[in-house]
């Protein structure tokens, strides 16, 4: 039962991570630049994302422009786009693998196969978490590098946007959820082979689990 609880918690965390990752990739708040107007107040804020850039005026009016040319984008931005999409697709694949092996589904009947699928989904979610982390950390590194670069003027320096924090959260949730699904595996995985171990046991108490966990027909 504890194993099922951990599985549910793991998959809930990964789902939250996936949603966070989707929002992070879609929102144009990766890099933020504030421009000071005549009266020493922020006149405009420019948000840059993976797909578009937006300008928010002091009046609150916002206008966004989708990047018209992929070729015009820096290679790191193109890579971030690709990794973001791949990470989301990998996580979706992980979810499908999990659903096939979940305790409450009947896609796969054998318990050891189910356990293997849950373990696989956990690993896939961890990979997705790492893939999410790469573009976020890379972009943050570029912003911080420019911030401390004396050749970059003050007005040209950007700040970390909300999308980066969402990306870190997404990555953390995917890694944590995937890790939990991997951790449920030893208990899930040993349920299959335990049938055979029980056949050769001379006495039930030699196995630490309660006898109620095993089908009685397996006892010699």
């Amino acid at each position: 039962m504890a194993s099922a609880g951990m599985q549910i918690l793991g998959v809930v965390l990964t789902l939250l991570g996936w949603v966070n990752g989707l929002v992070s990739c879609a929102l144009p708040m990766w890099k933020v630049t504030a421009f000071i107007g005549n009266s020493i107040v922020v006149a405009q804020v420019v948000w840059e994302g993976l797909w578009m850039s937006c300008v928010v005026q002091s009046t609150g009016q916002m206008q966004c422009k989708v990047y018209d040319s992929l070729l015009a984008l820096p290679q790191d931005l193109q890579a971030a786009r690709a990794l973001c999409v791949i990470a989301l697709l990998v996580a979706l694949f992980g979810l499908l693998v999990y659903l096939a092996g979940a305790k409450c589904t009947t896609c796969v009947e054998e318990k050891d196969s189910k356990a293997r699928l849950v373990l696989t989904s956990g690993i896939v979610f961890v990979i997705s978490g790492v893939l999410t982390l790469i573009p976020v950390c890379w972009t943050a590194h570029a912003i911080i590098r420019d911030f401390y670069n004396p050749l970059v003027a003050e007005a040209q320096k950007r700040e970390l946007g909300a999308s980066l924090y969402l990306g870190w959260a997404a990555s953390g949730l995917l890694l944590l959820g995937g890790g939990l699904l991997c951790c449920t595996c030893p208990s899930g995985g040993s349920q299959g082979p335990s049938h055979y171990m029980a056949r050769y046991s001379t006495s039930a108490p030699a196995i630490s689990r309660g006898p109620s966990e095993y089908p009685t027909k397996n006892y010699v």
């Epitope: 850039s53 018209d68 015009a72 931005l77």
Partner: antibody, heavy 124, light 107 residues
């Protein structure tokens, strides 16, 4: 400090080609987009196009696209503009100018540092 | 293409006067307007961008305002060295377009 040093004035015959240079110093050449602007005698400013030195990506003003080729040499931090099939309409001062903003595309096309200009005279 | 219109080709002023140069865009450019100063025989010099943000080293007598399609460059107290050509430019999208210029001259 940021400097854009442009090549010497050019005198060319109609139908000929010229290639002018713009050597950048005082900043990381590949980080900033380089624009080119045309100014005919006693006239206003006309945008020619830009090049992103890191990738070589170019964008041109459609009116001048067939006449102009922009290139950049990362090793020497130099941007080049070639003008072909010259006519008297091409007699002008040509400026290279650095894009102020690091913002990738859209909104950020203000030009903060300009070269001293290269004068091109087309005469037979 | 976005057309930038500077309705006045010339503006006469005296030293110490307050002067405003206007520029109208053919469509909303979301305050993505820059102003340049050009003196005879020199290359243009960036004064303001984002309609109201002063570039490094630009005196605070130069201020900018506007939104949507209408933009203004104001010199609060004209100095002799301010007599020059002033261009507005939209930095909203390519192709970049400039106004025809307004020449500030002494009365």
């Amino acid at each position: 400090q940021v400097q854009l040093q442009q090549s010497a004035p050019e005198l060319a015959r109609p139908g000929a080609s010229v290639r002018m240079s713009c050597k950048a110093s005082g900043y990381t050449f590949t980080t900033y987009t380089m624009h080119w602007v045309k100014q005919r005698p006693g006239q206003g400013l006309e945008w020619i196009g830009f090049i992103i030195p890191s990738s070589g990506y170019t964008e041109y003003n459609q009116n001048l696209k067939d006449k102009t080729t922009l290139t950049a040499d990362k090793a020497s931090s130099t941007a080049y503009m070639q003008l072909t099939s010259l006519t008297s309409e091409d007699s002008a001062v040509y400026y290279c100018a650095r894009q102020f903003s690091l913002i990738t595309t859209g909104f950020g096309y203000a030009l903060d540092y300009w070269g001293q200009g290269t004068s091109v005279t087309v005469s037979s | 293409d976005i057309v930038m219109t500077q309705s006045r080709k010339f503006m006469s002023t005296s030293v110490g006067d307050r002067v405003s140069i206007t520029c109208k865009a053919s469509q909303d450019v979301s305050t993505a307007v820059a102003w340049y100063q050009q003196k005879p025989g020199q290359s243009p010099k960036l004064l303001l961008y984002w309609a109201s943000t002063r570039h490094t080293g630009v005196p605070d007598r130069f201020t900018g305002s506007g939104s949507g399609t209408d933009y203004t460059l104001t010199i609060s107290s004209v100095q002799a060295e301010d007599l020059a050509l002033y261009y507005c430019q939209q930095h909203y999208s390519t192709p970049l377009t400039f106004g025809a210029g307004t020449k500030l001259e002494l009365k």
